[in-house]
Interface confidence: low
């Protein structure tokens, strides 16, 4: 997250860091009680690596007792999505168990009604992605609120040049922006999750370049269809 | 038209506690921080902390943290901040203010209350 | 904490001159610097964010600049109306900090 701040502790009992070998790689959002929801692209050079799901943490390295590591079960990604495009870029990880719930675990409502958030929207974005250009990683969860793009402005040419269809929502990116290592994580509008991280190589911070996030309105139906 | 309407003067005997109010009109309440800012002659401005209106969280100033509590009530789109074991060096001007997003994201403390003056005295 | 030094807590002008107002950060705060000007008896208000851009309505007279630890907030040609304190406040890391003021007086 560049130009947020550190998050209040365990306010975002949602928060998933998708972690790759004991290491955090990804954001993720806990959307039902054994299933966390990512970015497909995260587990693209996962290839024999052990993918776990930390739920319950504010800081990645210190003891907190609601911390708990999972096991995947299964992941689950989209079927249509692929390495080199930034479309369907989603992914269902299946927990080991049931997560355990409490004041710092939670799962986050979905929204299921597929219609544009508002332009100008203020949504909140989380992650343990980097706080700068020089790659700092963060050891506590960062956040920022970001106003909502209309997808006209984020498809003019300057911008994402017509990559932003239907099924993506856009948020400004003027030195506050989500970034490396926040892909998979949740933007929350109004409390509900509206979009998730897209996983490509950005660049952060810079306005003509805003962040990208897969609409989860548009996926309702496949989401449904991995949790039944 | 954004307003930020706060509450008027207090008088307070040394020790006691004072709870002042900030209410906001014209734009989404729960969807900007709001500050909390102290003017005293003797040290200018000073950020005391801010409140997420929509979860609640707050950020102090190490400095304030024990002598101001923030809080809101979304119903009424109202911002509160507690002063609690008051003494003359509490006697200012407390300022709340809000950021605001002008379509390139964060501006400054775009918006100020007007200013509620608290003063402390046996 | 980072500290925003304001040097001059007085500067004395004409109407019409050029002014320059000084604010130096205690470490690079990466341009996220804003101006604030209080005139007596009012809350402050906002003129300059990000060091270097406008706030709507504020008068192009008005121009702010800097990076790294030194800013300035530039009036071109000040008019009698600007008579006031300014501020320059930090919005890099918190807690927000702000410079001491200075005050602007016209000869």
């Known amino acids: 997250i560049l130009g947020g701040r550190e998050a209040e502790a365990h306010a975002r009992p949602y928060m998933a860091s998708v972690q790759l070998n004991g290491a955090h790689l990804c954001g993720g959002v806990l959307v039902a009680e054994q299933w966390v929801l990512s970015a497909a692209h995260c587990l693209e050079d996962a290839a024999d690596g052990k993918v776990q799901v930390l739920l319950g943490a504010h800081s990645l390295s210190q003891p907190e007792p609601s911390k708990r590591l999972y096991d995947v079960l299964r992941a689950v990604p989209h079927p249509d999505s692929q390495p080199d495009t930034i479309d369907h870029d989603l992914l269902l990880l299946q927990l080991s168990e049931k997560a355990t719930l409490g004041p710092a675990v939670r799962p986050l409502p979905w929204q299921r009604v597929d219609r544009d958030v508002a332009p100008g929207t203020l949504c909140d974005v989380a992650g343990w992605g980097i706080v700068n250009h020089a790659g700092r990683r963060p050891d506590s969860l960062q956040h920022v609120l970001l106003p909502v793009l209309d997808r006209a402005t984020c498809n003019r040419r300057t911008h994402h040049d017509g990559a932003i269809t239907e099924r993506l929502m856009c948020a400004e990116s003027n030195r506050r922006d989500s970034c490396k290592g926040d892909s998979g994580g949740p933007l929350v509008c109004g409390g509900v999750l509206e979009g998730v991280v897209t996983s490509g190589s950005r660049v952060c911070g810079n306005r003509k370049k805003p962040g990208i996030y897969t609409r989860v309105a548009s996926y309702a139906a496949w989401i449904d269809s991995v949790l039944a | 038209e954004v307003q930020l309407q706060q509450s008027g003067p207090e008088l307070v005997k040394p020790g006691a506690s004072v709870k002042i109010s900030c209410k906001a009109s014209g734009y989404s309440f729960t969807g900007y921080y709001m500050n909390w800012v102290k003017q005293s002659p003797e040290k200018s401005l000073e950020w005391i902390g801010d409140?997420?209106?929509?979860?609640?969280?707050?950020t102090y100033n190490q400095k304030f943290k024990a002598k101001a509590t923030l809080t809101v009530d979304k119903s009424s789109s109202t911002a509160y901040m507690q002063l609690k074991s008051l003494t003359s060096e509490d006697s200012a001007v407390y300022y709340c203010a809000t950021p605001y997003y002008y379509g390139s994201s964060y501006v400054g403390f775009a918006y100020w209350g007007q200013g509620t003056l608290v003063t402390v005295s046996a | 904490d980072i500290v925003m030094t304001q040097s001059h807590k007085f500067m004395s002008t004409s109407v019409g001159d050029r002014v320059s107002i000084t604010c130096k950060a205690s470490?690079?705060?990466?341009?996220?610097v804003d101006w604030y000007q209080q005139k007596p008896g009012q809350s402050p208000k906002l003129l300059i964010y990000w060091a270097s851009t406008r706030h709507t309505g504020v008068p192009d007279r008005f121009t702010g600049s800097g990076s790294g630890t030194d800013y300035t907030l530039t009036i071109s040609s000040v008019q009698a109306e600007d008579l006031a304190l300014y501020y320059c406040?930090?919005?890099?890391?918190?807690?927000?900090?702000f410079g001491g003021g200075t005050k602007l007086e016209i000869k």
């Open positions: 409140i997420n209106p929509s979860t609640g969280g707050t």
């Open positions: 406040q930090q919005h890099y890391s918190t807690p927000w900090t």
């Open positions: 470490q690079d705060v990466s341009t996220a």
